[in-house]
């Protein structure tokens, strides 16, 4: 009867509905390709229910399979900007713990100014996800153009 | 025991599995940038389980966090078409009630003929989502090229 | 009390959480536009929980509405490669049983080297999904660049 009892007694978070949607805070200092994220109702439509932010990077609190999604739009961009500054690449990966470091999702901008994708991937409690933007172009901080999120799907 | 009892007694919709996938019906008349959608099994693979259509726009019936996704492909399009008619932009937002009006998701076509993205966002009962396509180009009505949908994820 | 009892007694798979994320194995022989997929923990971060592979194609085991997602990146690609070899198109569809054959999702590369999209669609037990890549360009087999997956969402 464990599963039904868990549902009756435990709060929503313990049903495994961990979810987060983040907006861009800022880019990293020179030599740091990471994007730094922020989330919370005071900021608009971003939120964290379960996962946490650790110095702008997303840390997972529950083991499971997650849907990870991202959209990044380059600021002040046209197709000629994008091609002139090629390669500009966005990679989402597990950056810590180091033993689990791996690239999960990678896209190049080529002649476009926006990349958007999503994938299912197993994540473990304590995994920190980093989003690395290589190249010299700046991402837009508009909340409808650049965002990053995860959704717990199943154990 | 409230949660378990609710599960036993209430129909599927009340478990919070609201979901919709829509196909393009038509574009708006002059000066109306909105796309008008339709859904239902008679039309093919589109459906509405929970949300409703209000004059071709999607109205939410349950509060919660939703995954919103969209793909729009321009008809008779090549990379030169897209760049010649730039800027052609697609924006998904809450258009009513006016007090909650906000852009949720925005993409430009630049030199591409298809945009596709998805994001998590809180939506409330009564929110109506509009999809605005700026510019003069027509979207494809092929059901595998242009579609729009939402999926309830959690309260 | 059937629903609560089912939850207590049945394994996770019977709760309807079918999910799969696949990585590219190889392309088809000449005249076969299909991509052939593989999945399993020994291969990295790909997995099948419920659906199965049948000669590299994904077969559904549970009726329901699914979120289908895909990303395909062309190998050794630049925007000029992509435009020179246009049209290169990726289509995801039900390829068997023949009576249910239909294209679900279609994207062209135009001047880009990656396509990524997702959609909700009803699928039935026994449906086999095929991913057809037309043209002469090869997809990347990097697991962070090319992947294909499904997630059961609701009955």
């Amino acid at each position: 009867q464990r599963f039904a009892q868990a549902q009756q007694q435990l709060p929503l978070e313990s049903l495994g509905w961990d979810v987060a949607e983040l907006q861009l805070n800022h880019t990293g200092p020179q030599q740091d390709p990471r994007l730094y994220w922020q989330g919370g109702p005071a900021l608009g439509r971003s939120f964290l229910h379960g996962p946490e932010l650790d110095k702008g990077q997303l840390r997972i609190h529950r083991d499971g399979i997650y849907m990870v999604h991202i959209q990044v739009t380059l600021a002040i961009c046209s197709s000629t900007t994008a091609s002139r500054h090629h390669p500009t690449t966005l990679a989402v990966g597990i950056c810590s713990p180091a033993s689990r470091s791996i690239s999960l999702l990678r896209l190049s901008f080529h002649q476009g100014c926006t990349i958007a994708s999503q994938r299912l991937t197993p994540l473990a409690r304590g995994d920190t996800l980093c989003t690395n933007l290589t190249g010299t172009l700046l991402p837009s901080r508009n909340t409808d153009e650049t965002f990053f999120g995860v959704q717990w799907v199943r154990p | 025991q409230r949660f378990a009892q609710a599960q036993q007694q209430l129909p599927l919709e009340s478990l919070g599995w609201d979901v919709a996938e829509l196909q393009l019906n038509h574009t708006g008349p002059q000066q109306d940038p909105r796309l008008y959608w339709q859904g239902g099994p008679a039309l093919g693979r589109s459906f509405l389980h929970g949300p409703e259509l209000d004059k071709g726009q999607l109205r939410i019936h349950r509060d919660g966090i939703y995954m919103v996704h969209i793909q729009v492909t321009l008809a008779i399009c090549s990379s030169t078409t897209a760049s010649r008619h730039h800027p052609t932009t697609l924006a998904v937002g809450i258009c009513s009630p006016a007090s909650r009006s906000i852009s949720l998701l925005r993409l430009s076509f630049h030199q591409g003929c298809t945009i596709a993205s998805q994001r998590l966002t809180p939506l409330a009962r009564g929110d109506t989502l509009c999809t605005n396509l700026t510019g003069t180009l027509l979207p494809s009505r092929n059901t595998d090229e242009t579609f729009f949908g939402v999926q309830w994820v959690r309260p | 009390q059937r629903f609560a009892q089912a939850q207590q007694q049945l394994p996770l798979e019977s709760l309807g959480w079918d999910v799969a994320e696949l990585q590219l194995n190889h392309t088809g022989p000449q005249q076969d536009p299909r991509l052939y997929w593989q999945g399993g923990p020994a291969l990295g971060r790909s997995f099948l929980h419920g659906p199965e592979l049948d000669k590299g194609q994904l077969r559904i085991h549970r009726d329901g509405i699914y979120m289908v997602h895909i990303q395909v990146t062309l190998a050794i690609c630049s925007s000029t490669t992509a435009s020179r070899h246009h049209p290169t198109t990726l289509a995801v569809g039900i390829c068997s049983p023949a009576s249910r054959s239909i294209s679900l999702l279609r994207l062209s590369f135009h001047q880009g080297c990656t396509i990524a999209s997702q959609r909700l669609t009803p699928l039935a037990r026994g449906d086999t999904l095929c991913t057809n890549l037309t043209g002469t360009l090869l997809p990347s087999r990097n697991t962070d660049e090319t992947f294909f997956g499904v997630q059961w969402v609701r009955p």
Epitope: - | N25, A42, L43, R141 | -
Partner: nanobody, 118 residues
Framework: QLQLVESGGGLVQLGGSLTLSCTAS????????VGWYRQAPGSDRELVAL??????NYADSVEGRFTISRDNAKNTVYLQMNSLKPEDTAVYYC?????????????WGQGTQVTVSS
């Protein structure tokens, strides 16, 4: 049942102009997708111009030379073709794609031949 009849085709010199007409037996709605397709011998049918609700798209091969327009009062759609080239030689078909409660429905004309001589 919408019937479509094309007219205006013929033989024209390189660089010349023609206007094709497509007259419908009933109302063509603003929200209908109305297109002109063409098919050259040994080739697939190609969509060259499309209009609906004041939006218009053209194939690269005809952009700037062809113009699609409609006269709602006459239930007629036109294709003005300028600076014609030999590669424009084809049978031109009018198409109305109408969304119904059972999905899209296509209506076709019988076609009109356009031949461009050099």
């Amino acid at each position: 049942q919408l019937q479509l009849v094309e007219s205006g085709g013929g033989l024209v010199q390189l660089g010349g102009s023609l206007t094709l007409s497509c007259t419908a037996s009933g109302i063509i709605f603003n929200s209908d997708y109305v297109g002109w397709y063409r098919q050259a011998p040994g080739s697939d049918r190609e969509l060259v111009a499309l209009t609906s609700n004041m939006r218009t798209n053209y194939a690269d091969s005809v952009e700037g030379r062809f113009t699609i327009s409609r006269d709602n009062a006459k239930n007629t759609v036109y294709l003005q073709m300028n600076s014609l080239k030999p590669e424009d030689t084809a049978v031109y078909y009018c198409n109305v794609n109408r969304m119904t409660s059972y999905g899209p429905r296509d209506y076709w004309g019988q076609g009109t031949q356009v031949t461009v001589s050099s």
